[in-house]
């Protein structure tokens, strides 16, 4: 399936007071990632 976003890197965003980077979660919760779930494991982040 086409995957517009390459999910190898994580962490575009950071909001003070939040426990995680927004972009980390955004990538994990993107349409592109949802299409890949169950087909390949999450690649490790560097």
């Amino acid at each position: 399936l086409a995957d517009p976003l390459d999910h190898r890197d994580a962490g575009d965003l950071w909001f003070p007071g939040e426990s995680e980077s927004f972009e980390d979660a955004h990538v994990e919760h993107s349409i592109s990632r949802s299409l890949l779930e169950g087909e390949i494991p999450f690649p490790p982040t560097s």
Epitope: P4, L5, D9, A10, G11, D12, L13, W14, F15, S21, E23, A25, H26, E28, H29, S30, I31, S32, S34, L35, E37
Partner: antibody, heavy 114, light 112 residues
């Protein structure tokens, strides 16, 4: 095939309300964070609202221009997101897109005019 | 707010030649882990925006490699190495680093 289909646009008078619907298909919906972005007649794109997933307590975020007037929501069982728009202003006239920022719907026109 | 400005606002290119579009941010778009949150979209006439470049320099799936993105923390460039007819439309930069998310005003690309 990923599909995002917006409906509910129309011509409304200032001060009135309107509810937009974005029906999605072709991908597992419940874990996806969704957004509404609008495009003014001058073609400027403006992000207006964002809703997270159930695991994030359906947290929502809004642009100042719509905060207190617009409400984004979702129904995971129907794989659908909504945008309830109240106290509409002429400045809200735009094409409204639902998007995951990677995939976009075709858009729906909302015209606010007396 | 994070304000994005683009230049030029309109560009006319001969097919086969290269084109460059600039996007400047009033704030750094460098996030944690050295990820730069600058995205490029193309909106073809009568269509919805489509993702071209994410995180400043990464090509989205299905996008021809004649498109490339580069830049620093506040200054960014989209380059099209050999413009084709299908590249006509309005190019927008966007940032997803800070709320509210913002888009540039767009650059209209036309063919000579």
């Amino acid at each position: 095939e990923v599909q995002l289909v917006e409906t509910g646009g129309s011509l409304v008078q200032p001060g009135k309300s309107l509810k937009l619907t974005c029906a999605t298909s072709g991908f597992p919906f419940s874990n996806v964070w969704m957004h509404w972005v609008r495009q003014s007649p001058e073609k400027q794109l403006e992000w207006i609202a964002h809703i997270k997933a159930k695991s994030d307590n359906y947290a929502t975020y809004y642009a100042e221009s719509v905060k207190g007037r617009f409400t984004i929501s979702r129904d995971d069982s129907k794989t659908t997101i909504y945008l309830q728009m109240n106290s509409l202003k002429e400045a809200d006239t735009a094409i409204y897109y639902c998007t995951g920022l990677d995939y976009w719907g075709q858009g729906v026109m909302v015209t606010v005019s007396s | 707010d994070t304000v994005l400005t683009q230049a030029p606002l309109s560009v006319s290119v001969t097919p086969g030649e290269s084109a460059s579009i600039s996007c400047r941010s009033n704030k750094s778009l460098l996030g944690i882990r050295d990820i730069t949150s600058l995205y490029w979209y193309l909106q073809k006439p009568g269509k919805s925006p489509q993702l071209l470049i994410y995180r400043m320099s990464n090509l989205a799936s299905g996008v021809p490699d004649r498109f490339s993105g580069s830049g620093s923390e506040t200054d960014f460039t989209l380059k099209i190495s050999e413009v084709e007819t299908e590249d006509v439309g309005v190019y927008y930069c966007a940032q997803f680093l800070r709320y509210p998310y913002t888009f540039g005003p767009g650059t209209k690309l036309e063919l000579k």
